[in-house]
């Protein structure tokens, strides 16, 4: 494959990454799959400035990010280390709340209306953000 040098149409560039902001809702797994089909991943937030960039574009709306603990510990979908990385949880979160009556706890992270993060039931149909790095090799064949 060839390296991407600019963002696809309808994607927004910021600090050598491209972002796509949904305007509809999907369950976390469906959102994750959507991004993968676009040769991208659900957004991985690595700094406060990136957090603010994403906040600016999504507004005060619940929105999935690429962070989950469905297999035990919290993990970023691109392998970024959770423990040493940027975190922006709301106070008292994550709490793996079981009181919602939907079965199980809360294993997927989303941006809340104030931008900070909450864990929620992964089946909820929230908006989502895809991210892909400009410098990574594209799966598309090079143009001849």
């Amino acid at each position: 494959g060839s390296e991407r040098t600019c963002c696809p149409v309808n994607w927004v560039e910021h600090e050598r990454s491209c972002y796509w902001f949904s305007r509809s809702g999907k369950a976390w797994a469906d959102a994750d799959n959507y991004c993968r089909l676009e040769d991208a991943h659900l957004v991985v937030v690595t700094s406060w400035e990136e957090q603010k960039f994403v906040q600016h574009h999504i507004g005060p709306v619940n929105t999935w990010m690429g962070l989950h603990d469905q297999n035990g510990p919290w993990k970023w979908v691109d392998g970024t280390d959770y423990e040493t990385g940027f975190k922006n949880w709301r106070p008292e979160q994550p709490d793996d709340w079981y009181g919602h009556g939907l079965g199980g706890g809360e294993d997927c992270a989303h941006f809340t209306d104030d931008g900070r993060w909450n864990d929620d039931v992964c089946q909820r149909p929230y908006r989502w953000v895809c991210e892909t790095e400009l410098d990574k090799a594209s799966q598309e064949p090079p143009l001849l």
Epitope: W48, E49, K52, K87, P91, D114
Partner: antibody, heavy 119, light 107 residues
Framework: QVQLVESGGGVVQPGRSLRLSCAAS????????MHWVRQAPGKGLEWVSV????????YYEDSVKGRFTISRDNSKNTLYLQMNSLRAEDTAVYYC????????????WGQGTLVTVSS | DIQMTQSPSSLSASVGDGVTITCRAS??????LNWYQQKPGKAPKLLIY???SLQSGVPSRFSGSGSGTDFSLTISSLQPEDFATYYC?????????FGPGTKVDIK
Amino acid sequence: QVQLVESGGGVVQPGRSLRLSCAASGFTFSSYGMHWVRQAPGKGLEWVSVIWYDGSDKYYEDSVKGRFTISRDNSKNTLYLQMNSLRAEDTAVYYCARDHPRWSYGDYWGQGTLVTVSS
Amino acid sequence: DIQMTQSPSSLSASVGDGVTITCRASQTILSYLNWYQQKPGKAPKLLIYGVSSLQSGVPSRFSGSGSGTDFSLTISSLQPEDFATYYCQQSYSTPFTFGPGTKVDIK
């Protein structure tokens, strides 16, 4: 009502240390980030530092990095600024302000405490 | 670091006048632009956040606009209590920085 009261200011010699405190009341202190902002006599505002609601993240203005440390004690509803290796240019009124989690502005401010660094 | 500039540095106006203060950032700050008012010997008071959102309790004669790097604060009809110094601040990237201020005094 939200109230922020700074204390600990005074006259100190260059190279010495001072610790400022900001006592908070009227809101759930442990749920809010907090800022320190300073203002030299007759000058404009200068942002100094911010700390997250749980103390897990801290950011500083370049000129105070390595000399100033922001901290908090949520059990005492108090914010601190430990200032070491003080310089004449640190002379200012120091304000604490409550952070807005989305926009990072100061929505409530204390009345300020004056720090004078002079030999 | 992001530098913030303001113009003018001072202005003289009369009660009832409309005034506009501009603020420019050295790079994009998206919508993370706030305005404060400060009177002598007092703490700053938040007027506007997020470019154009009026803080609770602030009179509607204050308004903000702009995007990216260029912003403005407008006071539609100056009142006696509006004579003060006004500061813009970016809260996009640390260190958060203030403009140098604009002093509005009585003509």
